[in-house]
């Protein structure tokens, strides 16, 4: 642990004559620096140099060639490595006064004229005289304000808001300071911090905007942490809103975003007067270019029952926002001519849900449906086939005679989706055909009976059964069935000999 540096002259304060020169020496066990009034300035009349000596100590000399009122203030010698932005400098101090009969008060930076007080805390109105002997009074609109005065610091007290002026008289001449504006700040023991990012997904070249708002608190220090921080890419802004309540809105803007700007954006608010901290973060992603992803919640072949109500839902992830449209058999779906509707709803920032709704499914609703999502950078589509399932029904059941051969063909035409299966049944005892047990299924391998099925179109099927010879009257039943239902019809086949007898009669 190093002992504090030492200063020559070894005094707390020193009064230096106007326009004279003075020098301060600092000795330390390590490298030392000076902090002094106007040290932000490249001041031509303050010179700092290192001095060699044989004591083994580091020596730094501060020299002022022509002292002026502006040189009045605290001079601090400190070890280089101990300086931190947060803390007050630790080191050895000397206060220098340079009395000037024409300049009663040390010129201040303009921000010093804004005195911030928190709640009922005490504050300092920092009017400092160039001469420690100068009497000073403090005034506001009500007159002289009682407060304790220290020429090194100013007036210390509890002040109400408004303008305050320090007044001094030097050799019969009156001086006043620029008005100090005492401003009361609201500070709460807890930090109410809200973060907002209207967008978390961007593409290259766009501007990222993130805001953090602090409510009911004016004594706040807010820091941003974000991927482009090292490069200083962000522009920060502060807006103060007073109505209906105090709100500090901090905005971080990152123009011309690139993929490298993807990551966590964090704001950390710290109560400037208390150790209260609060942080919020949001993850931002920047894509090289826009994108679209389509996720259907159904397969590429879908069936719907006749008159059924059915919804087909497609999830879409896209940025920038997509235009979504539906096609049927490659033609734009005209909704008002059908009982089909479509809609799109935004679920999240880049998530959308589109629905195709069949209100009462009809046969003609069958077909190929395509959803198309597109933005300026991408186009994606998804096509599925829809079949309207119709219960099977028999359109026609007819017989056909083969003339002299005595053979007969029965034709059964049925429709339905899916295409119905056709089964044939036969009842040989015409008197007992009312009894189900009298009916037997025609097997395909029976000699002299041929069954065949032909598909006429997508939803119509024709079944044929050919009897080589019909020798007695029989009943034939056609049974058409699919997943949704079955229908049957019966036909009587009369033997040709019987038919001719009937004709003669």
């Amino acid at each position: 642990q190093l002992s504090l540096p030492s200063i020559l002259p070894n005094e707390n304060e020193k009064v230096v004559q106007l326009n004279s020169s003075f020098s301060l020496r600092c000795f330390g066990e390590s490298e030392v620096s000076w902090q002094y009034p106007m040290s932000e300035e490249e001041s031509s009349d303050v010179e700092i140099r290192n001095e060699e000596n044989n004591s083994g100590l580091f020596v730094t000399v501060l020299e002022v060639s022509s002292a002026s009122a502006a040189h009045t203030g605290l001079y601090t010698c400190y070890y280089n490595h101990t300086q931190t932005e947060e803390n007050e400098l630790e080191g050895r101090h000397i206060y220098i006064y340079v009395p000037d009969p024409d300049v009663a008060f040390v010129p201040l930076g303009m921000t010093d004229y804004l005195v911030i007080v928190e709640d009922d805390d005490s504050a300092i109105i920092p009017c400092r005289t160039t001469d420690p002997e100068t009497p000073v009074t403090l005034h506001n609109s009500e007159g002289v304000v009682p407060a304790s005065y220290d020429s090194r610091q100013g007036f210390n007290g509890t002040f109400t808001v408004g303008p305050y002026i320090c007044e001094a008289t030097v050799k019969g001449k009156k001086f006043q300071t620029i008005p100090f504006n005492v401003y009361a700040l609201k500070a709460t023991s807890e930090l109410d911090l809200e973060m907002e990012a209207l967008k978390t997904v961007y593409k290259s070249g766009e501007t990222i905007v993130v805001t953090c708002a602090v409510f009911n608190n004016e004594v706040v220090d807010l820091q941003w942490t974000y991927p482009g921080e090292v490069k200083g890419k962000g522009i920060t802004m502060l807006e103060e809103i007073k109505v209906p309540s105090i709100k500090l809105v901090y905005t971080l803007t990152v123009p011309e975003a690139t993929v490298k700007d993807s990551g966590d954006y964090e704001c950390a608010a710290r109560q400037a007067t208390r150790e209260v901290k609060e942080m919020k973060k949001v993850t931002i992603s920047v894509h090289e270019k826009g994108f679209i992803e389509i996720k259907p919640t159904f397969s590429q072949l879908e069936a719907v029952n006749l008159h059924e109500v059915k919804h087909f839902v497609v999830e879409v992830r896209a940025y920038p926002p997509p235009r979504i449209s539906w096609l049927k058999n490659n033609l734009t779906l005209i909704e008002n001519l059908t009982e089909i509707t479509t809609d799109v709803e935004k679920i999240q920032e880049i998530r959308y849900r589109s629905k195709l709704k069949l209100i009462r499914a009809k046969e003609e609703d069958s077909g190929h449906y395509t959803i198309v999502a597109q933005n300026e950078d991408a186009v994606k589509s998804y096509t599925f086939e829809l079949l309207t399932q119709v219960p099977s029904s028999i359109l026609d059941l007819v017989d056909d005679h083969h003339g002299s051969t005595g053979g007969q063909t029965v034709r059964c035409t049925a429709e339905g989706t899916p295409l119905p299966d056709i089964e044939w049944m036969i009842c040989k005892d015409i008197k007992k055909c009312n009894n189900e047990t009298s009916w037997t299924i025609l097997a395909n391998n029976v000699s002299n009976i041929i069954t065949e099925i032909h598909s006429r179109d997508r939803s119509t099927v024709e079944g044929r059964v050919t009897f080589a010879k019909v020798e007695e009257t029989i009943a034939v039943r056609c049974l058409a069935k699919n997943l949704l239902g079955a229908e049957n019809r019966e036909l009587k086949l009369v033997a040709p000999t019987l038919r001719s007898e009937l004709t003669v009669a």
Partner: antibody
Framework: QVQLVQSGAEVKKPGASVKVSCKAS????????MYWVRQAPGQGLEWMGI????????SYAQKFQGRVTMTRDTSTSTVYMELSSLRSEDTAVYYC??????????WGQGTLVTVSS | DIQMTQSPSSLSASVGDRVTITCRAS??????LNWYQQKPGKAPKLLVY???SLQSGVPSRFSGSGSGTDFTLTISSLQPEDFATYYC?????????FGGGTKVEIK
Amino acid sequence: QVQLVQSGAEVKKPGASVKVSCKASGYTFTSYYMYWVRQAPGQGLEWMGIINPSGGSTSYAQKFQGRVTMTRDTSTSTVYMELSSLRSEDTAVYYCARGSSPFFDYWGQGTLVTVSS
Amino acid sequence: DIQMTQSPSSLSASVGDRVTITCRASQIISHFLNWYQQKPGKAPKLLVYVASSLQSGVPSRFSGSGSGTDFTLTISSLQPEDFATYYCQQSFSIPLTFGGGTKVEIK
């Protein structure tokens, strides 16, 4: 003796900027504030702002905020006042004035700025 | 902002007259009121500061008084060189503001 010498008259077009200089001598430049005051033809005086030459900090009247910039060069003991986006109503005599208090014991001779298309 | 109102806006007087110009502030400004004299084509000149202090080199016929909101500049015996325009200025609060001026003319 204290002297404030300002730059010469200027004629500017609307939308342009003007930069007026004020060179101080005869006193310690960094010990006194410099103020800028303007006076339109036949009108009264209007305070524009202040600069502390020691450090360069400034405070501007709300009316000029965003349009006025006050700077200084300590090596030449000169302060500058730049007014941008000029309009015809900015036609005025612009004065720099010194003061350790917010009243002005020494004034420059004034610089007439005429804004005309 | 504090508004400063001067009256009269102009007056005619003769050499040797006692002349009084008043200045009223829109709110209390304690005694932080200053007076300037301006002659045509010239820069203003500080006469009186903090209500009643006479700037060095200013003749003693000029005096200032008042506090709160009402202030007065008095010229006890008007001289030929005093025909000019006089302005008051408050230094109590930022922005610093001036009165509209009082023109003193020869009768």
